[in-house]
Interface confidence: medium
């Protein structure tokens, strides 16, 4: 992927809207939308006052760890759906899109240098462990996906792209 493709706001916007769409199709869906197990996902809460003052490398650690856990969670959701007796087609479509979207975002972040950033800060080893929550429905899973992209990922790429422009 071109190194700064993710710095084009339209690129991230596409994934944000996909994530929101996925969340919207699960609104009011109970029958098809239970995961039947608790899946660990990243806690997406952002204290923006503190985040704004965090080293970009520390932000990268949080984003990279969160993205890895979220990808794992969505893949687990996909597996559960495949194994269910009658997967609901719209849900299947959005889960597949989320899996593909997270793969692409991982590639785009790697191209931006997020992985290097996440390894290089001296305090990376002593960084606080990633806060997690659990999701037991696809609605919650998609909500976390949407929140993660809208929050930490967008805030980090905005900062990393600005830093790279200097």
């Amino acid at each position: 992927a071109p190194p700064r493709l993710i710095c084009d706001s339209r690129v991230l916007e596409r994934y944000l809207l996909e994530a929101k769409e996925a969340e919207n199709i699960t609104t009011g869906c109970a029958e098809h939308c239970s995961l039947n197990e608790n899946i660990t996902v990243p806690d997406t809460k952002v204290n923006f006052y503190a985040w704004k003052r965090m080293e970009v490398g520390q932000q990268a650690v949080e984003v990279w760890q969160g993205l890895a856990l979220l990808s794992e969670a969505v893949l687990r959701g996909q597996a559960l759906l495949v194994n269910s007796s009658q997967p609901w087609e719209p849900l299947q479509l959005h889960v597949d899109k989320a899996v593909s979207g997270l793969r692409s975002l991982t590639t785009l972040l790697r191209a931006l240098g997020a992985q290097k950033e996440a390894i290089s800060p001296p305090d990376a080893a002593s960084a606080a462990p990633l806060r997690t929550i659990t999701a037991d429905t696809f609605r919650k899973l998609f909500r976390v996906y949407s929140n993660f992209l809208r929050g930490k990922l967008k805030l980090y790429t905005g900062e990393a792209c600005r830093t790279g422009d200097r």
């Epitope: 809460k45 204290n47 993660f148 929050g151 930490k152 905005g158």
Partner: antibody
Framework: QVQLVQSGAEVKKPGSSVKVSCKAS????????ISWVRQAPGQGLEWMGG????????DYAQKFQGRVTITADESTSTAYMELSSLRSEDTAVYYC????????????????WGRGTLVTVSS | SYVLTQPPSVSVAPGKTARITCSGD??????VHWYQQKPGQAPVLVIY???ERPSGIPERFSGSNSGNTATLTISRVEAGDEADYYC???????????FGGGTKLTVL
């Protein structure tokens, strides 16, 4: 039940400063950021800035940068907003609002509001 | 910085449905919150994250966000719903909370 009690109305001269207080009760003070929002007579809401009591980090809207200082005193569960170099356009009701993470939000929203403090700037 | 545009006023008869709009560039990309403010009172959060209702807010209040417009819908409007309504987003490019200009809802 969360309550935010603000200091009383103030009349100030142009060029002077005003410091408005906001005392919180109910819930843990340090767990939630406090924002300050103002509303000029007959006008809309305008975010001025806010503070995270845990870190003491404050952030300000561009428009007020350099003129506003937001602080928090954990021992008294009170947040303060000081606005300097006052001019007549600063005549407004100043609200403090406590931010809260609702289920499923990545960012806290302004869930609880004080009743507001009217600041009148007049010579 | 980001701009949210609301109509200055909306009028509706009691029992009917009121729709208050809030437009901005790529607004579906943002999460929109709505506040109600009655004369002489502090604002009250009525919808957060596009379409979620805080506890204590009647089901008559709902929200949506698609196209280039976020909408606050109040069904079966009552006289007590007469107030100013403000939309709000967090604009992370400027790291600021942004409010719309407000819409005065009049119940005829």
């Amino acid at each position: 039940q969360v309550q935010l009690v603000q200091s009383g109305a103030e009349v100030k001269k142009p060029g002077s400063s005003v410091k408005v207080s906001c005392k919180a009760s109910g819930g843990t003070f340090r767990s939630y950021a406090i924002s300050w929002v103002r509303q000029a007579p007959g006008q809309g809401l305008e975010w001025m800035g806010g503070i995270d009591p845990i870190s003491g980090f404050a952030d300000y809207a561009q428009k007020f940068q350099g003129r506003v200082t937001i602080t928090a005193d954990e021992s008294t569960s009170t947040a303060y907003m000081e606005l300097s170099s006052l001019r007549s356009e600063d005549t407004a009701v100043y609200y403090c609002a406590r931010e809260l993470y609702y289920p499923g939000t990545w960012m806290a929203v302004m869930a609880y509001w004080g009743r507001g403090t009217l600041v009148t700037v007049s010579s | 910085s980001y701009v949210l545009t609301q109509p200055p006023s909306v009028s509706v008869a009691p029992g009917k449905t009121a729709r208050i709009t809030c437009s901005g560039d790529n607004i579906p990309e943002y999460y929109v919150h709505w506040y109600q403010q009655k004369p002489g009172q502090a604002p009250v959060l009525v919808i957060y994250r596009d379409n979620e209702r805080p506890s204590g807010i009647p089901e008559r209040f709902s929200g949506s966000n698609s196209g280039n417009t976020a909408t606050l819908t109040i069904s079966r409007v009552e006289a007590g719903d007469e107030a100013d309504y403000y939309c709000q987003v967090f604009d992370e490019s400027s790291w600021h909370w942004v409010f719309g200009g407000g819409t005065k809802l009049t119940v005829l």
